[in-house]
């Protein structure tokens, strides 16, 4: 379950998955750093079938994927990564 839009919830992810998603099925990734009342980092994945999932930031595969994307950040990324700046 994921609260997609901004609500009074301080954390947007109610439930997190650690199940691997191949990168070709990922549309974009949003990283929400700790803060603004949410005590944990959150990673939200938009998939190409229009569904959305919160991924456990400790899942090895997402850590590997984020590292690969960071290394490629100088080129155009097939999977955009968005970090929300919290006011």
């Amino acid at each position: 379950v994921l609260e997609v839009y901004y609500t009074s919830l301080r954390c947007r992810c109610v439930q997190e998955s650690s199940v691997f998603i191949p990168r070709r099925f990922i549309d974009r990734i949003q990283i929400l750093p700790r803060g603004n009342g949410c005590p944990r980092k959150e990673i939200i994945v938009w998939k190409k079938n229009k569904s959305i999932v919160c991924v456990d930031p400790q899942a090895e595969w997402i850590q590997r994927m984020m590292e690969v994307l960071r290394k490629r950040s100088s080129s155009t990324l097939p999977v955009p990564v968005f970090k929300r700046k919290i006011p």
Epitope: I21, R24, K48, N49
Partner: antibody
């Protein structure tokens, strides 16, 4: 020995329906994403649909969205493709194939022998 | 959608020849490219994945290279069993196959 065996192909009229099955053995089926790929007679390969480990996530090429449904039954080691509102351009050999395992590894490459679907009046 | 342009569409060569097949992607796919071999009436067989990793059991005369948008499959010394059709596949964003290259005996 790894085996994927498709069944359910045949001749169907435009607008009709068909359900393909792929029976799997020789590996842990539930550890793998699975896909359907088709090949029109004398033509190239075309990805049709993919499904994740538990069947909760499915993906389709645009031309089959809303007409085809991919599903799986891990207890029966079987993959399915329900094809509705079939068109002449869906005529092809349909292959089931493995994708990555649960860790994103491409250790295995397994395909079925193919099932011929002919859409014609 | 990512388009894959494969060339040539057909190629005549002799046993012992060195052969190169090219695939161009319409956008950056990094190294997420696979090469398949297909013989008439048979399912495709993966030769190379992640651009240059040889599938277990595939002879070392097959090699792959490239990155970004341009990729090549090279067969260093053609053997009789290599005459077949070859396809590239991008798996950076969903899947797109190249149109295929039919490798025939000269």
């Amino acid at each position: 020995e790894v085996q994927l065996v498709e069944s359910g192909g045949g001749l169907v009229q435009p607008g009709g329906s068909l359900r393909l099955s792929c029976a799997v053995s020789g590996f842990t089926f539930s550890d793998y994403y699975m896909a359907w790929v088709r090949q029109a007679p004398g033509k190239g390969l075309e990805w049709v649909a993919s499904i994740n480990y538990d069947g909760g996530d499915t993906y389709y090429r645009d031309s089959v969205k809303g007409r085809f449904t991919v599903s799986r039954d891990n207890a029966k080691n079987s993959l399915y493709l329900q094809m509705n509102s079939l068109r002449a351009e869906d005529t092809a050999v349909y292959y089931c194939a493995t994708e990555e395992d649960y860790d994103g590894s491409y250790v295995m490459d397994a395909w079925g022998q193919g099932a011929l679907v002919t859409v014609s009046s | 959608d990512i388009q894959m342009t494969q060339s040539p569409s057909s190629l005549s060569a002799s046993v012992g020849d060195r052969v190169t097949i090219t695939c161009k992607a319409s956008q950056n796919i990094n190294k997420e490219l696979t090469w398949y071999q297909q013989k008439p009436g048979k399912a495709p067989k993966r030769l190379i994945y992640n651009t240059n990793i040889l599938q277990t059991g595939v002879p070392s005369r097959f090699s792959g290279s490239g990155s970004g948008t341009e990729f090549t499959l090279t067969i260093s010394s053609l053997q009789p069993e290599d005459f077949a059709t070859y396809f590239c596949l991008q798996q950076s964003s969903l899947y797109t196959f190249g149109q295929g290259t039919k490798l025939e005996i000269k």
